[in-house]
């Protein structure tokens, strides 16, 4: 799996999970989240050569097409596969509320 | 939806469905599929600005992050959403067989 266990331990130009810390105020302009101040969102990036963690038959076809036709703009892209939620604290006036924001943290990647 | 009905009628730089015909022999080097000789595979391509057909909360966060930090390499990518199968004719020796290959045709796209 193209997850932290593999990607953070290997220098990998191909599609892999990359570390990314997001500060809510600085990076997103969000002032409404009180806790946490930021989080490890991570992201997916890297090349998708033939058979590198292809998601579907179409992405396999596309990466093979791209190998044979390298000048073409059609190629698979490295995107998130498994995502996890993030629990946040925010306020309604003076009343604290806890909410779980779904699909906030990328845990693994795929070529799609 | 970023499908043929929308994307093939509009000139769109942002993430959208693009037409792509694949000839099995010429483009993939596949001789084993006897019919069809090729098919309209299509592909997804284009920019993913903030809120342009974002797939998850993470892709919305990432596109907003990318707007505020344009020099960053972290940004969502335009990938396939709905896919359809393709029915093919192949041979076992001299015996013809029909098979449905799943996820071969892209019908719509998303920013993920």
């Amino acid at each position: 799996a193209l997850d932290a266990a593999y990607c953070f331990r290997n220098v990998q130009d191909n599609c892999c999970l990359r570390p990314l810390y997001i500060d809510f105020k600085r990076d997103l302009g969000w002032k409404w989240i009180h806790e946490p101040k930021g989080y490890n969102a991570n992201f997916c990036a890297g090349a998708c050569p033939y058979l590198w963690s292809s998601d579907t038959q179409h992405s396999r076809v596309l990466s093979l097409y791209n190998t044979i036709n390298p000048e073409a703009s059609a190629s698979p892209c490295c995107v998130s596969q498994d995502l996890e939620p993030l629990t946040i604290l925010y306020y309604i006036g003076k009343t604290p509320k806890i909410e779980q924001l779904s699909n906030m943290i990328v845990k693994s990647c795929k070529c799609s | 939806a970023l499908d043929a009905a929308y994307c093939f009628r509009n000139v769109q730089d942002n993430c959208c469905l693009r037409p792509l015909y694949i000839d099995f022999k010429r483009d993939l080097g596949w001789k084993w599929i006897h019919e069809p000789k090729g098919y309209n595979a299509n592909f997804c391509a284009g920019a993913c600005p903030y809120l342009w057909s974002s797939d998850t909360q993470h892709s919305r966060v990432l596109s907003l992050y990318n707007t505020i930090n344009p020099e960053a390499s972290a940004s969502p990518c335009c990938v396939s959403q709905d896919l359809e199968p393709l029915t093919i004719l192949y041979y076992i020796g001299k015996t013809p067989k029909i098979e449905q290959l799943s996820n071969m045709i892209v019908k719509s796209c998303k920013c993920s």
Epitope: - | K31, W32, Y91, I92
Partner: nanobody
């Protein structure tokens, strides 16, 4: 890198048996088609049979049906040609050929295979 290596050829009496092996490397797991061919002196290469590695579907030419059987062992990445009731006309160089792109099926035509083994000699004489 795709490679096919045959072994198991030799000399046998009419009515005898041989099992040829073709070790396949460089193929995607369980995918691809393997064909067996033979070439007798001064003759065209003849398709004997083939197998789809994924689902194990096989085909045998009429000339060897009931005598020759093709099987696969995907763990060992090996395809076998079991030859029984051998006849003098079965002599020749036996080749295995591979098409790693095949998701399904296998061909009886030599032109559809990109990769070939070095061949193994089979002699049938009393």
């Amino acid at each position: 890198e795709v490679q096919l290596v045959e072994s198991g050829g030799g000399e046998v009496r009419p009515g005898g048996s041989l099992r040829l092996s073709c070790v396949v490397s460089g193929f995607t797991k369980d995918y691809g088609a393997i064909g067996w061919f033979r070439q007798a002196p001064g003759q065209e290469r003849e398709g004997l049979g083939c197998i789809a590695r994924k689902d194990g579907d096989t085909w045998s030419a009429d000339s060897v049906k009931g005598r020759f059987t093709i099987s696969r062992d995907n763990v060992r990445n090996t395809v076998y040609l079991q030859m029984n009731a051998l006849k003098p006309e079965d002599r020749g160089v036996y080749y295995c050929a591979g098409d790693p792109s095949a998701l399904y099926g296998c061909s009886d035509r030599s032109s559809e295979y990109q990769y070939w083994g070095q061949g193994t000699q089979v002699t049938v004489s009393s």
